[in-house]
Amino acid sequence: YKLVCYYTSWSQYREGDGSCFPDALDRFLCTHIIYSFANISNDHIDTWEWNDVTLYGMLNTLKNRNPNLKTLLSVGGWNFGSQRFSKIASNTQSRRTFIKSVPPFLRTHGFDGLDLAWLYPGRRDKQHFTTLIKEMKAEFIKEAQPGKKQLLLSAALSAGKVTIDSSYDIAKISQHLDFISIMTYDFHGAWRGTTGHHSPLFRGQEDASPDRFSNTDYAVGYMLRLGAPASKLVMGIPTFGRSFTLASSETGVGAPISGPGIPGRFTKEAGTLAYYEICDFLRGATVHRILGQQVPYATKGNQWVGYDDQESVKSKVQYLKDRQLAGAMVWALDLDDFQGSFCGQDLRFPLTNAIKDALAAT
C-alpha cells in the first residue's frame, strides 16, 4: 500500500516546538512525501518561499538512507488561487510553457514527481484540467526516453460531490495519473452553523441531503463509480481537527455554534487544531465517539473539536483495504505529533505510524 504524506513548507514558521523542517521527518514512515506548495510564475514552475530550495534539499536528502522513498512537489494550493491556474491551463502557450518547465525543475531539485493541487477547477475548467494532466503526462513520458526513471504525476482532488461533478472528468484524468489523493476531510465547517465532524468515515444517522454526501465512504464510492480505478485511489486522512465555539449548553453533534474554535497555540488558525494541539486540548476534555461515523470529538468548556485518533485511523485503513484502494494519504506530517512530545506516547508521528501499522497488518 501507498502511504502518501504531505509536508507543508509554512510549518517552518510556527513558533517553538511547532516549527517543522523536512529533516525532522522520518524517512521510513511514508512511501511518498509531497512537498507543499510550489508556485507558478511567468508560466514557469517556481518556488513559493525564497528558502524553499533549502527545504527541498533537506527533504530529498532523506532518500539517501531510504532509496525506496519517493518525493513529489505539489503545485498550487489554496493561496495560489483557482483563477491563476485557470489562466495557465486554458491558454495553449501558457500551458505548454508551464509543462515544459516542470521536468528540469523537478530533476534539478531531486523530486520524483509532480502533484497537482488545483483547488479547484471551475465548471469551465473541467476540460482544461484534463488536458493539462494529459499533456503533462505525455511530457513526462517523452522526458524519460533517454533511460531516465519516469516522473510521477498525481493530483489532489476534492471529496465534495458538487466539486467532483463540476471540476473533474474522473474517468479521463485517472488514465494519466499515477495516483489520485482524495481529500476526504473538511466535509463540515463553521459555515454550517452547527457542530459536525469534518472527516467522518460513514454517513451520520441524522444526515439528510446534502449531508449524506459529506463523508469518506460516499466520496470514495462516488469516485469509484465515476471510473477511478481503486488501484490509483489514495484516501485522505487528516492529522488535524476542525473546532467550533459552542453557542449553548448543547455539546453533541449538531449543536449550535457561534463560530470557529479558538486558534491553536502553534497553528494560530481559528477553527483548526493540529493533532499535537489536540493532545494538549484533551487534558481535561470530554471525549465522545460518533459511533456510526467511527470518529471522535472532544469538548471542553465552549470548545468542540472533531478529529482523528489512532482508533479512527485504523478504522479508515481497514475501510480502504476492504475497498482495495491504493493506500492512504496524510495531511499533514507537520500537524501530527512530529516531535513525539505532546501526545504522551514517546512516539513521533503517532497518527501516521498508526496508519502505517494498519496498512502493514494482515
Partner: antibody, heavy 117, light 107 residues
Framework: EVQLVESGGGLAQPGGSLRLSCAAS????????MHWVRQAPGKGLEWVSS????????NYADSVKGRFTISRDNSKNTLYLQMNSLRAEDTAVYYC??????????WGQGTLVTVSS | DIQMTQSPSSLSASVGDRVTITCRAS??????LNWYQQKPGKAPKLLIY???RLQSGVPSRFSGSGSGTDFTLTISSLQPEDFATYYC?????????FGQGTKVEIK
C-alpha cells in the same frame, strides 16, 4: 562544476550607469534563484538584490531600490544588474551568487565598481 | 530591518583551539541563519545554512547552533586554513542582512 563569472565593473561617474553581467555554468540556471551581494572596500557584506528562478519575483535592498534593476536571461544562463544613478557609496566589489534557498552557496570572484568623479 | 550583531568583532587563537562566534538577531528569525567564511581577496564561502546544517564539502569541525535570536558558530579544533573573517546572515525576511563580521587571527 559551478562557475559564476561577473563582468561589467569599472569606473563610473556619480549619476552614471553600469550594467553588470554574471555568466553561469555547471548547474541548471533556470531552476535557481540568483543574487547580487556587494562589499565596500575594507567593509562587510551587503545583500543587494535577488531574483527567483522564473524571474517573476525580485527584491532589492532599500539603498538601491529605484536605481538598480535585477534581471536574468535563462536561455543565456546570465544574470544582470543594471545600475543607474550611481553614487560614491555604491563603490564596492559586486558578487553574483547562486541561491540555495535563502543562502548563497556559490559565489563569483566579484567585479569592482568604482564611482568617482 | 533585522539587525545582526556578531561578537567578538575579532579574536586571536592558536591552531587546535576551540573557537566560538556568536550572532544575535534583533528579532526572532526562527532557524534562518547562515554562516560564511571569507579569506582576504576571495569570495565568501557558505559553511552552515539554516542555523545548524553543514554545507556539503565543509569540514565537520564547523558546527552551528541556535534558533530564535541567538546563534553560535563553533570551530572545534582550529586549523591553519581557518584563519579568516566569518559572517552570519539572516534569511528570515527581506532585506537579508549580514553581521559585521568576526576576524579570526593567529595568536
Amino acid at each position: 562544476e559551478v562557475q559564476l563569472v561577473e563582468s561589467g565593473g569599472g569606473l563610473a561617474q556619480p549619476g552614471g550607469s553600469l550594467r553588470l553581467s554574471c555568466a553561469a555554468s555547471g548547474f541548471t540556471f533556470s531552476s535557481y534563484a540568483m543574487h547580487w551581494v556587494r562589499q565596500a572596500p575594507g567593509k562587510g557584506l551587503e545583500w543587494v538584490s535577488s531574483i527567483k528562478s522564473s524571474g517573476g519575483s525580485k527584491n532589492y535592498a532599500d539603498s538601491v531600490k529605484g536605481r538598480f534593476t535585477i534581471s536574468r536571461d535563462n536561455s543565456k544562463n546570465t544574470l544582470y544588474l543594471q545600475m543607474n544613478s550611481l553614487r560614491a557609496e555604491d563603490t564596492a566589489v559586486y558578487y553574483c551568487a547562486k541561491g540555495y534557498g535563502a543562502s548563497f552557496d556559490f559565489w563569483g570572484q566579484g567585479t569592482l565598481v568604482t564611482v568617482s568623479s | 530591518d533585522i539587525q545582526m550583531t556578531q561578537s567578538p568583532s575579532s579574536l586571536s587563537a592558536s591552531v587546535g583551539d576551540r573557537v566560538t562566534i556568536t550572532c544575535r538577531a534583533s528579532q526572532d528569525i526562527s532557524s534562518w541563519l547562515n554562516w560564511y567564511q571569507q579569506k582576504p581577496g576571495k569570495a565568501p564561502k557558505l559553511l552552515i545554512y539554516a542555523a545548524s546544517r553543514l554545507q556539503s564539502g565543509v569540514p565537520s569541525r564547523f558546527s552551528g547552533s541556535g534558533s530564535g535570536t541567538d546563534f553560535t558558530l563553533t570551530i572545534s579544533s582550529l586549523q591553519p586554513e581557518d584563519f579568516a573573517t566569518y559572517y552570519c546572515q539572516q534569511a528570515y525576511s527581506f532585506p537579508w542582512t549580514f553581521g559585521q563580521g568576526t576576524k579570526v587571527e593567529i595568536k
